[in-house]
């Protein structure tokens, strides 16, 4: 008789997810001099042992302790970029202007994007069949505790000028449940950060709007302020014109307005 | 306890192309680079390349591209390395590693003797 | 290129003596360098890598220290299954490039 499992209602693990990590950290030591001295299979060891074996709606920050220590890394705190409901624009950036980073080009971040994972309570196995919903299950599950751990971190490392890219085609350009919204705003440090810049990317060619004038970009400026760091916005009308210019800043065309 | 095991040794005409297999055991493979290094008789070691077989995207240093051909089957957890265009100075033992920058495992070695 | 300098070429040591090996690279590798111990007919075996972490299972004779430009592996005490010849590596740069090696020899 087989053994009665939990359904959840997210997708199951996804396949092949410890060769998928292993894998990647391996690419990623490989390619980030600065962070040979990684052992992936001790950064492996401490991730399974977030979530294995624990019950995928109680996991706790303190679970991914061992992994966020063996995964410390530094990088230039005046060169971070949060995005929110935008990755892949944010990822084609920091792709081209190599000085920035966002959280998936730190090592913890590049291991886990895109991934699902989840265990069982009791057991060492992996669930490849369900796990957690954020909004119908439970919020802390293995995957929200570990994003919500890296960002909160990410975001307390964060000096001088942070920028974010927002996405301007959504109906809230800036969402309190977002990770951005609830965890990142709420973790730059005042003492640090002296400016927070948002990018709000236009989605239709013909959009002329300015929507740093949006309603949400308002009530995210009032809390920065309330924060005692400045906010200051930036619409990029022309997304493919913006990125073609960090490639070639020279460009003739890159003078005028984006 | 990872292993590396090499195909055997070989004799090859200048101009021609040699390919050197290496089975893992012993432990996972697919997430580990493997990488070459060879050694000509007396001399030093000299990387030539490696790769992670989950990604299968090789890296190869720029004095072997273009004859070099590195490839991996997960399903035999076996690497193989294709040198092509050989000449007598690619006489060398040729070795394979896991690791794709410092190598902590090695195989056995094979002996590719180019001569006319 | 990196270039990677060994020296001396040859050491000549009595067992139960120190040997200290250098290796110096043509341009700063941090602390990504490794050392290598290789015996006659054999595959080389990994002693030391970020420049002063002993793999596993080696002796506690050997400690590497340096980085930027100069390394050195030091053998304290010398046992007569250490006489081989020592390489180092520097994977900091692609491509990973080797010194071309010590000879550690019974004096």
């Known amino acids: 008789v087989p053994r009665w499992r939990q359904q959840w209602s997210g997708p199951g693990t996804t396949k092949r997810f410890p060769e998928t990590v292993l894998a990647r950290c391996v690419k990623y030591t490989e390619i980030h001099p600065e962070m040979r001295h990684v052992d992936c299979q001790s950064v492996w060891d401490a991730f399974k042992g977030a979530f294995i074996s624990k019950h995928p709606c109680n996991i706790t920050e303190e679970d991914y302790q061992p992994l966020m220590k063996l995964g410390t890394q530094t990088v230039p705190c005046n060169k971070i970029l949060l995005w929110s409901r935008i990755k892949d624009l944010a990822h084609q950036f920091t792709q081209v202007q190599r000085d920035m980073f966002t959280l998936e080009d730190t090592l913890l971040g590049y291991l886990a994007d895109d991934l699902t994972w989840c265990g069982e309570f009791n057991t060492s196995k992996i669930n490849y069949q369900s796990c957690p919903d954020w909004r119908k299950d439970c919020s802390n599950n293995p995957v929200s505790v570990f994003w919500k751990t890296v960002s909160r971190r990410f975001a307390e490392a964060a000096c001088d000028v942070v920028h974010v890219m927002l996405n301007g085609s959504r109906s809230k350009i800036f969402d309190k449940n977002s990770t951005f919204g609830s965890v990142e705003v709420h973790n730059l440090q005042p003492e640090k950060v002296q400016t927070l810049e948002a990018w709000v990317i236009h989605g239709g060619r013909e959009d002329s709007r300015d929507l740093c004038q949006d309603p949400t970009i308002k009530e995210l400026e009032s809390i920065i302020s309330k924060r005692n760091i400045q906010f200051s916005c930036k619409n990029i009308y022309r997304p493919d014109k913006f990125l073609q210019c960090v490639k070639n800043p020279e460009d003739s065309s890159c003078t005028s307005e984006i | 306890q990872v292993q590396l095991v090499q195909s055997g040794a070989e004799v090859k005409k200048p101009g021609s192309s040699v390919k050197v297999s290496c089975k893992a055991s012993g432990g996972l493979f697919s997430f580990y680079a493997i990488s070459w290094v060879r050694q000509a008789p007396g001399q030093g070691l000299e990387w030539m390349g490696g790769?992670?077989?989950?990604?299968?995207?090789?890296q190869y240093a720029q004095k072997f591209q273009g004859r070099v051909t590195i490839t991996a089957d997960e399903s035999t957890s076996t690497a193989y390395m294709e040198l092509s265009s050989l000449r007598s100075e690619d006489t060398a033992v040729y070795y394979c590693a896991r690791g794709s920058y410092r190598f902590d495992v090695w195989g056995q070695g094979t002996l590719v003797t180019v001569s006319a | 290129e990196i270039v990677m300098t060994q020296s001396p070429a040859t050491l000549s040591v009595s067992p139960g003596e120190r040997a200290t090996l250098s290796c110096r690279a043509s341009?700063?590798?941090?602390?990504?360098l490794a050392w290598y111990q290789q015996k006659p007919g054999q595959a080389p075996r990994l002693l030391i890598y970020?420049?002063?972490t002993r793999a596993t299972g080696i002796p506690a004779r050997f400690s590497g220290s340096g980085s930027g430009t100069e390394f050195t592996l030091t053998i304290s005490s010398l046992q007569s299954e250490d006489f081989a010849v020592y390489y180092c590596q520097q994977y900091n740069n692609w491509p990973w490039t080797f010194g071309q090696g010590t000879k550690v020899e019974i004096k």
């Open positions: 790769i992670i077989p989950f990604f299968g995207e090789p």
């Open positions: 341009q700063s590798v941090s602390s990504n």
């Open positions: 970020g420049a002063s």
